[in-house]
């Protein structure tokens, strides 16, 4: 017998989607061999409709996909927009169609529900609203109107025009009698429950001349939308529950065992600790829709997610809900990158951010995740030359090393810089990555003076002391501006005396500014790098003043001024939230906006919060 297993029968209705999972023994050969879905012909052949090697038959174009999950030993065939023509016998299998590694599946697609024997069929999603219309004749216009539910053999009164409401429907049902012109009454039931499903009878009048109408109410649990994302990638759940719940608390929960659905995030401020630093709930639109972005997908994030609306901010009976089945593909296109970067107070970090290498021209961004309320991520810097005011002189986004990675350097670290940061671009929204910066005990490796004052027209020499651990690194000085840090000539002055227990390999490298002008005022960085990979940096602010006495200035560590206090956060923050995260085009439009730049998109990037890799701040 074949080791392949799957559903023997699949029954659905026209217009629906099916998701057929086939299980195979996850041997290394099986994991990487061709997977296929084929239709069995009358003469015994099996015609491929879709395969893991990219083939899609014209019959399935635009409505089917096949996804392999090698680590689980499964592959999934999704087929949308079913028609009765899709009914038939199929095989899901491995290798070549004619060989034995396959499983037979019978797919039966029937007509959708409609009117059956004068019974109106109402098919409504769980938690939503149904309106059951009940016509009557003129002679019953003044008589009692009622709705019954068939429970077993007996009709049970649900509501009537005299004011009775069955306790199971209290607070969520009403009976409306239309104006005199219309011979119709309607019963509106809100917050539909699964238990509301069944046969109903509406009646006008109570005698033999009464008008009766049958209704069949089908309450559907939402069909989970299948979502496939890469490990370390990002997923966005768009939740549209309708305007009737616009003012009700929203939630996203992840189903655990049994009927439990553990809140991941809600609009009442709750957030699961496992998602700290890697989740944003975007404020809802007027129509009540909202979205949740999760970055740094981990293997354990896979599962069934429900979003819904309820005053408690969690799943309750009668909550309107949407459902997703998230699969996390471990054969990820998103490379591993450090999830934790450590730096010391006064020191620096260099963060490597992956992006989709096919989108080298995309705009790169870096933002600081804030957990307040539902989470947000105000932008700090972009690759187009914008830097948030309070980060001037200590933050730079560099396109290097390129080819799928950019670098963000942050120096003059304080304890307030500890937290979660997101790397993202205005291109592929699946490539959002998160990195946590931790501030640890220790001294910065590079030693520079504090603030330095240069004199117009004179020469200024600024020292930077590199310990011996950086002997093999390239050492540089550069002048910071909001588009990067432009390299400047520097002089190696030989071994440094600034380090105890450090041999001849330590270095003193000086920056010399000849004939200082006003344009020389600003931030200067010294740093180390290896090729296009950056390590530690240290920053010095050079102020320029009028000449007081002749001569050149040579600054030592001791003479340096104290570093200025950190600037207060500017009010014109740009952040990833609201519609921006849902619409990458907002990025493109934003360039036309004045420099307050209040809004930006959370376009797609990713994070490996799932790995324990760490990167030190001092070197790569």
């Amino acid at each position: 017998k074949s080791p392949i297993f799957g559903p023997e029968e699949v029954n659905s209705v026209e217009g629906n989607s099916v998701s057929i999972t086939c299980y195979y023994p996850p041997t290394s050969v099986n994991r990487h061999t061709r997977k296929y879905w084929c239709r069995q012909g009358a003469r015994g052949g099996c015609i491929t409709l879709i395969s893991s090697e990219g083939y899609v038959s014209s019959k399935y174009a635009g409505r089917a996909n096949l996804t392999n999950f090698p680590e689980n030993g499964t592959f999934v065939v999704n087929i949308a927009q079913l028609s009765q023509d899709d009914s038939g016998r199929y095989k899901c299998g491995l290798g070549i169609n004619s060989r034995g590694l396959s499983f037979d599946v019978s797919l039966e697609v029937s007509q959708g529900p409609g009117l059956l024997n004068d019974t109106k069929v109402y098919t409504v999603d769980l938690g939503r609203t149904v309106t059951i219309n009940c016509p009557f004749k003129t002679e019953n216009a003044q008589k009692r109107k009622s709705l019954y539910k068939q429970i077993g053999l007996y009709p049970v009164l649900v509501i009537d025009s005299s004011g009775y409401v069955n306790p199971n429907y209290t607070g969520r049902i009403r009976l409306d009698i239309q104006g005199t012109g219309q011979l119709l009454f309607s019963v509106v039931i809100n917050q539909l429950r699964l238990s509301d499903a069944g046969q109903y009878l509406c009646q006008a009048g109570d005698d033999s001349n009464s008008n009766k109408k049958n209704a069949d109410l089908q309450v559907l649990k939402p069909e989970p939308e299948l979502v496939y994302e890469d490990l370390r990638g990002s997923v966005t759940f768009h939740c549209a529950l309708g305007p009737e719940v616009a003012n009700v608390a929203k939630f996203l929960c992840r189903q655990s065992s049994g009927e439990n659905c553990d809140v991941v995030v809600n609009t009442l401020g709750k957030r699961a600790p496992a998602f700290e630093g890697r989740i944003l709930l975007n404020p809802q639109d007027k129509d009540g829709s909202f979205s949740v972005v999760i970055t740094g997908l981990r293997k354990e994030d896979a599962g069934r997610y429900l979003c819904g609306a309820h005053s408690d901010g969690q799943l309750q009976e009668g909550s309107p809900i949407q459902a997703w089945q998230l699969f996390v593909n471990e054969e990820s296109t998103i490379p591993r990158s450090p999830t934790v970067v450590k730096g010391v107070a006064g020191g620096s970090v260099a963060v490597l951010c992956p992006y989709n290498r096919k989108e080298s021209k995309s705009i790169k961004y870096w933002c600081l995740w804030e957990g307040a309320q539902n989470g947000r991520c105000p932008l700090l810097v972009d690759s187009e030359g914008w830097v948030k005011a309070q980060y001037e002189g200590r933050l730079s986004l560099l396109e290097e090393p390129g080819n799928g990675t950019f670098t963000v350097i942050l120096n003059q670290l304080t304890s307030r810089d500890a937290g979660f940061y997101w790397c993202l671009t205005n291109g592929d929204t699946l490539w959002r990555t998160t990195v946590e910066i931790k501030i640890i005990e220790g001294e910065p490796n590079l030693k520079v003076p504090g603030n330095v004052t240069a004199v117009l027209g004179e020469t200024l020499k600024v020292p930077c002391h590199f310990p011996c651990k950086f002997s093999s690194y390239e050492k540089y000085w550069c002048k910071w501006n909001n588009t990067g840090c432009q390299a400047l000539p520097s002089q190696d002055e030989g071994p440094s005396k600034a380090f105890v227990n450090c041999d001849e390999n330590s270095r003193l490298v000086s920056l010399t500014l000849n004939l200082v002008t006003r344009a020389d005022e600003g931030w200067y960085w010294c740093g180390v790098k290896q090729g296009h990979f950056y390590g530690e940096t240290a920053a010095v602010y050079v102020a320029v003043e009028e000449r007081k006495a002749a001569g050149s200035r040579d600054v030592s560590l001791a003479k340096a001024d104290a570093a200025p206090d950190e600037k207060v956060l500017d009010s014109g923050f740009r952040e990833i939230e609201n519609k921006a995260i849902q619409d990458p085009r907002l990025f493109a439009e934003e360039k036309a906006v004045a420099d307050t730049r209040d809004q930006a998109d959370g376009s797609r990037a990713s994070v490996d919060s799932g790995s324990s890799e760490e990167q030190g701040g001092s070197s790569r």
Partner: nanobody, 126 residues
Framework: EVQLVESGGGLVQAGDSLRLSCAAS????????MGWFRQAPGKEREFVAT??????????YYADSVKGRFTISRDNAKNTVYLQMNSLKPEDTAVYYC?????????????????WGQGTLVTVSS
């Protein structure tokens, strides 16, 4: 909590038929699959059949040993699952357990199911 109550077991002759029912009550909001497992004396509990659903789509899974003889079905309105057993064999003798749960993964795996019934005994004599 979800409660499962099985019925329909009994003593039959080889070749006969039997229909098992499993009624679910309680909060079944996130139950997307119900199935049958069986345990013969001195043996491990084994998968028989499962029905999973998603909206108006049903997926039916069977163990090789019962294919073509057993049929699983459900009545959505009654929250009940049935196992129609035809052409019964003495080796089908076992306690049959109804199981329910989210069943996100392989329906043959016991821990995919969150709730279990008490079991109903099926004895097939030769």
């Amino acid at each position: 909590e979800v409660q499962l109550v099985e019925s329909g077991g009994g003593l039959v002759q080889a070749g006969d038929s039997l229909r098992l029912s499993c009624a679910a009550s309680g909060r079944t909001l996130t139950t997307y699959g119900m199935g049958w497992f069986r345990q013969a004396p001195g043996k491990e509990r084994e998968f028989v059949a499962t029905i999973k659903w998603s909206g108006s789509t049903n997926y039916k899974y069977y163990a090789d040993s019962v294919k073509g003889r057993f049929t699983i079905s459900r009545d959505n309105a009654k929250n009940t699952v049935y196992l129609q057993m035809n052409s019964l064999k003495p080796e089908d003798t076992a306690v049959y357990y109804c199981a329910a749960g989210t069943v996100l993964g392989d329906p043959r795996v016991l821990n995919e199911y969150d709730y279990w019934g008490q079991g109903t005994l099926v004895t097939v004599s030769s």
